[in-house]
């Protein structure tokens, strides 16, 4: 019986220009983790392979850093980074386990306040 579960940071928010750590944790299984894929929608952000190490997709290499652990750090956030992120654990012998994180990137409180009361 495959009983593994993925715990994630769930729904999180961060300020524009800041950074955020995306974390997933696989528990309740003795399966061996062979690879973790980090994806946004169906775009590959990064891969951590147990034997071969980390790879960050070229289009994200300036703003994505590996770790901590099997997690992923997103830097220089923009409002376009708002959306769903998935950690996909490839394990042996269970197969794949998928975790979902929703990130909302907010304007900074100063910018938000300024925009709200801006005179046209």
């Amino acid at each position: 019986m495959m009983t593994g579960t993925i715990e994630t940071t769930g729904n999180i928010s961060a300020e524009k220009g800041g950074s955020i750590i995306l974390q997933c944790h696989l528990s309740s299984t003795t399966a061996q983790v062979t690879q973790v894929n980090w994806e946004q929608q169906d775009q590959l952000l990064a891969i951590c392979n147990a034997d071969l190490g980390w790879h960050i997709s070229p289009s994200f290499k300036d703003r994505v850093a590996p770790g901590p652990g099997l997690g992923l750090t997103l830097q220089s956030l923009t409002v376009n980074d708002t959306g769903e992120y998935f950690c996909i654990y490839h394990t042996y012998p269970d197969g794949t386990y998928t975790g979902r994180i929703f990130l909302e990137v907010l304007e900074s409180s100063v910018a938000e306040h300024g925009a709200r009361f801006q005179i046209p």
């Epitope: 062979t34 590959l44 997709s57 490839h90």
Partner: antibody, heavy 121, light 110 residues
Framework: EVQLVESGGGLVQPGGSLRLSCAAS????????VPWVRKAPGKGLEWVGY????????YYADEVKGRFTISADDSKNSLYLQMNSLKTEDTAVYYC??????????????WGQGTLVTVSS | RIVMTQTPLSLSVTPGQPASISCQAS??????LAWYLDKPGQPPQLLIS???KLASGVPDRFSGSGSGTDFTLKISRVEAEDVGVYYC????????????FGGGTKVEIK
Amino acid sequence: EVQLVESGGGLVQPGGSLRLSCAASGFDFSSYGVPWVRKAPGKGLEWVGYIDPIFGPTYYADEVKGRFTISADDSKNSLYLQMNSLKTEDTAVYYCARDYSYGYAYALDIWGQGTLVTVSS
Amino acid sequence: RIVMTQTPLSLSVTPGQPASISCQASQRISPYLAWYLDKPGQPPQLLISRASKLASGVPDRFSGSGSGTDFTLKISRVEAEDVGVYYCQSYYVHTSSGYAFGGGTKVEIK
């Protein structure tokens, strides 16, 4: 236009060798996984092997391991399948195909037309 | 390695009627499940990726669903051009990684 074109198929005797080529155009070949897949007469689709586009290892199906070798020439945007010690059960149409998301979508969106390999005495 | 089991082996459908094909994997594969249509004399065509994402140019009468180990391809109203062999496919990551195809389901028109 994004396309893949295979060549090099033909008739070969059991125990013989053949080298297939796959020429890619319209996309950056080195940034995609391009596996070889075959379809034997009256049989289903069968994965043959591919080069991992990110980490570099080459993987093969058990049925061809030790007999087939895949290589690539990024400067020519081409992939090759060297087939040695051919068996009659290797008779098939051989396709190269593109894995659409940097080689890690694990789904093949572009296929060549295929090249027929016949192993017979 | 993963074993992909498709059912049924063949299907005869009246035009305009729905059709459904199942694919079961020997281990969890979500979300990496794709469906293809293979017609004689043509290369296979990607229909669905990531279990439910319709490929570019594919009619919306095709849909995919499922998660974990069990997946389904549905055709809401079968047309004559839909005849051929349908394959599910996944991928496994281990010491020997690779693509895995189901055995195929032949769809014919009554």
